[in-house]
Interface confidence: medium
């Protein structure tokens, strides 16, 4: 229904706290360099204006669209061109072009320092002094570093953060209470960020149809007892919510997500028997819980999929008359029977089925042609299953750090032109798949591994798009989203690459490495490993292991030495010489 004032409508629906949080996220995601104080000032102005519209919907400017109101605010920021360069040109455009322009200038890898967590005492002091400002800083810092973070979900993580601080700041040992809990939230939020970015990429590159197909597969796996009409309704609503968030319409997105959660809880009988626990929770927790609710028990009496999609004499008629609905039904039926498959795999199977019908329905004897289609799925299913087995075996053998190193070597060989920081970040993220997925029960491994890898590789593609350097990466990133992971897995050593010159300074270390946290130490060592591979792309695993073991021993020895500086300056050059010899 149309409202006289859109901003008043959203303020009323969301309430002041969520309204302010979402406006802050929106501004922080658009203008990623502005300080918290600058954004907080704008948020207060927008909120005050929204209140005047709630009081009188026909007050001046209350009838303007949210894009117009927010865009005008952003464009009024002083020194916009000095700070943001050509983004300021967006302000010469009219809506909706202006908003599109802002979206195009979102930076997936902003040059901001890493978000450092203050030490426990300081954190608790500022949290107690002003919890609202403290949470505002959290929203601002996360949103500007992750410009596509799913806004209503970021409010959920802020709420988690708040609860942890409330609990831990009352304890004697604040540090040991806070650290593991906040690390847990951070890890979950980072995964949430790459997953959502993948959804926005799907929407931006391939449109709503592609996202809806993803949603149909995912929802059918989770709710196998819901019928196709119900799944279609949920997928349509979910597509709308994600389209809004990816498009920067955060107030509408959060409002519609709350509506969808309400609908699901009011219609549990036709959706799933597993929703009640989620539905008993308050809004943000409820929506989060529903988004990762366990799969419902599969109906016992599902007929074989072949009956409708291979054996039925009307297959080609069904397909010809309404392709999308017929393929959607296939995807629904196949997905509800396979919670053990990844969404990417299910979409590849649907694509294979579609290609088979396209070919066979044009032939003289279609049933004879498409009769073997289900058997032809076998290699498509085996490939990711083998990937999971091989990688989980390797993870179990090497542990997370060793597994990350193995992946780093593999990916540096595949795309040695990619910058070392990007390769290290990608390998560390890809390597976490072991800890995240390999410990799960067998039937949950494949969906966990492949869908997580796809999301990480999407980030690799986004970073590479900014500065394309590798033809291998360009090739894999140009194809469809669901083919990316198999494409990257199939890449071998890039034979066109001219090895890097050996530079001693790349492998020269100083005593300051000794005081770094373990994570930073690992990154330094992994940076050296990537550089070694770039120098000798065809080095054997044995050679690389020898060098890295030597390197680890060197660090250990010098960091324990009484005179660390002397140890580094004398032993360092020896290490470099030994490295060169080992790789010769």
């Amino acid at each position: 229904e149309a409202h006289k004032s859109e901003i008043a409508h959203r303020y009323n629906d969301l309430g002041e706290q969520h309204f302010k949080g979402l406006v802050l996220i929106a501004f922080s995601q658009y203008l990623q360099k502005c300080s918290y104080d600058e954004h907080a000032k704008l948020v207060q102005e927008v909120t005050d204006f929204a209140k005047t519209c709630v009081a009188d919907e026909s007050a001046a400017n209350c009838d303007k669209s949210l894009h117009t109101l927010f865009g005008d605010k952003l464009c009024a920021i002083p020194n916009l061109r000095e700070n943001y360069g050509e983004l300021a040109d967006c302000c010469t455009k009219q809506e909706p072009e202006r908003n599109e322009c802002f979206l195009q200038h979102k930076d997936d890898n902003p040059s901001l320092p890493p978000f450092e967590r203050p030490e426990a005492e300081a954190m608790c002091t500022s949290f107690k002094e002003n919890p609202t400002t403290f949470m505002g800083h959290y929203l601002h810092e996360v949103a500007r570093r992750h410009p596509y973070f799913y806004a209503p979900e970021l409010l959920y993580y802020a709420e988690q953060y708040n609860e942890i601080l409330t609990q831990c700041c009352a304890e004697a040992d604040k540090e040991s209470c806070l650290t593991p809990k906040l690390d847990g939230v951070k890890e979950k939020a980072l995964v949430s960020s790459v997953r959502q970015r993948m959804k926005c990429s799907s929407m931006q590159k391939f449109g709503e149809r592609a996202f809806k197909a993803w949603a149909v597969a995912r929802l059918s796996q989770t709710f196998p007892n819901a019928d196709f009409a119900e799944i279609t309704k949920l997928a349509t609503d979910l597509t709308k919510v994600n389209k809004e968030c990816c498009h920067g319409d955060l107030l509408e997105c959060a409002d519609d997500r709350a509506e969808l959660a309400k609908y699901m809880c009011e219609n549990q009988a036709t959706i799933s028997s597993k929703l009640q626990t989620c539905c008993d929770k308050p809004l943000l927790k409820k929506a989060h819980c529903l988004s990762e609710v366990e799969h419902d028990t599969m109906p016992a009496d599902l007929p074989a999929i072949a009956a409708d999609f291979v054996e039925d004499q009307e297959v080609c008629k069904n397909y010809a008359e309404a392709k999308d609905v017929f393929l959607g039904t296939f995807l629904y039926e196949y997905s509800r029977r396979h919670p053990d498959y990844s969404v990417s795999l299910l979409l590849r199977l649907a694509k294979k089925y579609e290609a088979t019908l396209e070919k066979c329905c044009a032939e003289a004897n279609p049933p004879a042609c498409y009769g073997t289609v289900l058997a032809e799925f076998q290699p498509l299913v085996e490939e990711p299953k083998n990937l999971v087995k091989t990688n989980c075996d390797l993870y179990e053998k090497l542990g997370e750090y060793g597994f990350q190193n193995a992946i780093l070597v593999r990916y540096t060989q595949k795309a040695p032109q990619v910058s070392t920081p990007t390769l290290v970040e990608a390998a560390r993220n890809l390597g976490r798949v072991g800890t995240k997925c390999c410990t799960l029960p067998e039937d949950q491994r494949l969906p966990c591994v492949e869908d997580y890898l796809s999301a990480i590789l999407n980030r690799v593609c986004l970073l590479h798009e900014k500065t394309p350097v590798s033809e291998h990466v360009t090739k894999c990133c140009s194809g469809s989203l669901v083919e990316r992971r198999p494409c990257f897995s199939a890449l071998t050593v890039d034979e066109t690459y001219v090895p890097k010159e050996f530079k001693a300074e790349t492998f020269t270390f100083h005593s300051d490495i000794c005081t770094l946290p373990e994570k930073e130490k690992q990154i330094k060592k992994q940076t050296a490993l990537a550089e070694l591979v770039k120098h000798k792309p065809k080095a054997t695993a044995e050679q690389l292991k020898t060098v890295m073991d030597d390197f680890a021993q060197f660090l250990d020895t010098c960091c324990k030495a009484a005179d660390k500086d002397t140890c580094f300056s004398t032993e360092g050059p020896n290490l470099v010489t030994r490295c060169k010899d080992a790789l010769a």
């Epitope: 019928d227 196709f228 009409a229 007929p303 009307e314 008629k317 069904n318 309404a322 609905v325 039904t329």
Partner: nanobody
């Protein structure tokens, strides 16, 4: 759950017409693939006509093509079968069957339909 109730059967002379109705409850009929089957004395159930859910794609057995028309009225949640040029071999009990949540796919295989009405008798005789 879907409940189906057929009506409109009766005695009719060869060449005559009848219109069967099937009222559905518990589910919107446009979200459901629905079909008419018939069973002549001493024979198995035979597919007559079907209509997809969500999209109005119709299907007919070769024996009734051009004579029978399947349709539905979503506002009344009712399925119809208009039968013209009736023949003695059309004599049978006519059943309405539904497959919820499978738009389009109105299989000719009776076993794939979980919901059935109680049937209405059509007799074609002079």
């Amino acid at each position: 759950e879907v409940q189906l109730l057929e009506s409109g059967g009766g005695l009719v002379q060869p060449g005559g017409s009848l219109r069967l109705s099937c009222a559905a409850s518990g589910r919107y009929i446009d979200e459901t693939a629905v079909a008419w089957f018939r069973q002549a004395p001493g024979k198995g159930r035979e597919f007559v006509a079907g209509i997809g859910g969500g999209v109005d794609i119709t299907y007919y057995a070769d024996s009734v093509k051009g004579r029978f028309t399947i349709s539905r009225d979503n506002s009344k949640n009712t399925l119809y079968l208009q039968m013209n040029s009736l023949r003695p071999e059309d004599t049978a009990v006519y059943y309405c069957a539904a497959r919820p949540g499978r738009p389009l796919i109105t299989s000719k295989v009776a076993d794939l339909y979980p919901y059935w009405g109680q049937g209405t008798l059509v007799t074609v005789s002079s």
